[in-house]
Amino acid sequence: HNTTVFQGVEGQSLQVSCPYDSMKHWGRRKAWCRQLGEKGPCQRVVSTHNLWLLSFLRRRNGSTAITDDTLGGTLTITLRNLQPHDAGFYQCQSLHGSEADTLRKVLVEVLADPLDHRDAGDLWVPGESESFEDAHVEHSISRSLLEGEIPFPPTS
């Protein structure tokens, strides 16, 4: 799998999309997990509804939400109120039994807010109390890592 980079601005919302073959993954729940190191496990952040027929319902864990268009074949993850600690490597997964297939590898990059919140003027930034439904979702910038780029740079 190539890694797709999604960039979002600190304090705003980032939407990550993971397309998949709806027939191949028919009846399978999905999950969003965070990769802990290059060889480490992928730690589950949030998964779709327990009942596959209700996968379209938005499920939340903290500031992360997930919803699945099972007929169209698109898993969507929303990271709300993006913070620097949200940056890192993630996976979209398709679950079957105790196994998980990787649908997409994702690198989330968090950019500093170029306006800086104190000088934002009339710019509306969704607060913690506001729901996902109300949150303004910025168009994410995404690209695939170029061949030869190292997803996990070696640590000294």
């Epitope: 028919w26 009846g27 509804h49 327990n50 009942l51 596959w52 027929l53 209700l54 379209f56 319902l57 938005r58 499920r59 939340r60 099972t70 007929l71």
Partner: antibody
Framework: EVQLVESGGGLVQPGRSLRLSCTAS????????MSWFRQAPGKGLEWVGF??????????EYTASVKGRFTISRDGSKSIAYLQMNSLKTEDTAVYYC?????????????????WGQGTMVTVSS | DIQMTQSPSSLSASVGDRVTITCQAS??????LNWYQQKPGKAPKLLIY???NLETGVPSRFSGSGSGTDFTFTISSLQPEDIATYYC????????FGGGTKVEIK
């Protein structure tokens, strides 16, 4: 008139099988998720399972206590949903209801059930 | 699995009274909650869906509110025909019902 009518209930011995039918009329059957519920005498409501609309190719989901014993199916040409109950237990004794999942105007659905049948009694006893 | 705790289990009120029933979820269920009315010997009837949306044809004296873990169902002015058992139903986890609230007229 939108209507659901259940049939097939009765007295059955533990370990035996029974098939319930739910005949729909007054709406486009294939566009709706159909569900089964049950209510033991003097008790509350319990979801049994449901079957997806035509778009979902009749995919089924069940509550844990009936999984592997009960099977929901549908016949679009007859507008009938079925509940096949095998290996029945005394604790399966209940009034069984079929119900229609509510559709939003934009075409999605919500697991709220807006049309119900009158119910059919299933008694599992030796 | 999510547990739905409905209270009170029964209540008695006079015609015209405001009646309130609560439903508490064991964890956050957003607004994924419905309310039903069941009269003796009859099938349930959907009254409220998505926590606060009134089902078509249901009298406006019925209302629902809440989100997260705490939900409220209200009959603004109790009528004789409202004698029934009322159930909440979540759909965040599976499809679990509360234990029901039996409403009687004083």
């Amino acid at each position: 008139e939108v209507q659901l009518v259940e049939s097939g209930g009765g007295l059955v011995q533990p370990g035996r099988s029974l098939r319930l039918s739910c005949t729909a009329s007054g709406f486009t059957f294939g566009e709706y998720t159909m569900s089964w519920f049950r209510q033991a005498p003097g008790k509350g409501l319990e979801w049994v399972g449901f079957i997806g609309s035509k778009a979902y190719a009749g995919t089924t989901e069940y509550t844990a206590s009936v999984k592997g014993r009960f099977t929901i199916s549908r016949d679009g040409s007859k507008s009938i949903a079925y509940l096949q109950m095998n290996s029945l237990k005394t604790e399966d004794t209940a009034v069984y209801y079929c119900a229609r999942g509510k559709r939003y105007s934009y075409g999605g659905w919500v697991p709220a059930f807006d049309v119900w049948g009158q119910g059919t009694m299933v008694t599992v006893s030796s | 699995d999510i547990q739905m705790t409905q209270s009170p289990s029964s209540l008695s009120a006079s015609v015209g009274d405001r009646v309130t029933i609560t439903c508490q979820a064991s964890q956050d269920i957003t607004n994924y909650l419905n309310w039903y009315q069941q009269k003796p010997g009859k099938a349930p009837k959907l009254l409220i869906y998505d926590a606060s949306n009134l089902e078509t044809g249901v009298p406006s004296r019925f209302s629902g509110s809440g989100s997260g873990t705490d939900f409220t169902f209200t009959i603004s002015s109790l009528q004789p025909e409202d004698i029934a058992t009322y159930y909440c139903q979540e759909y965040d986890s599976y499809l679990a019902f509360g234990g029901g609230t039996k409403v009687e007229i004083k």
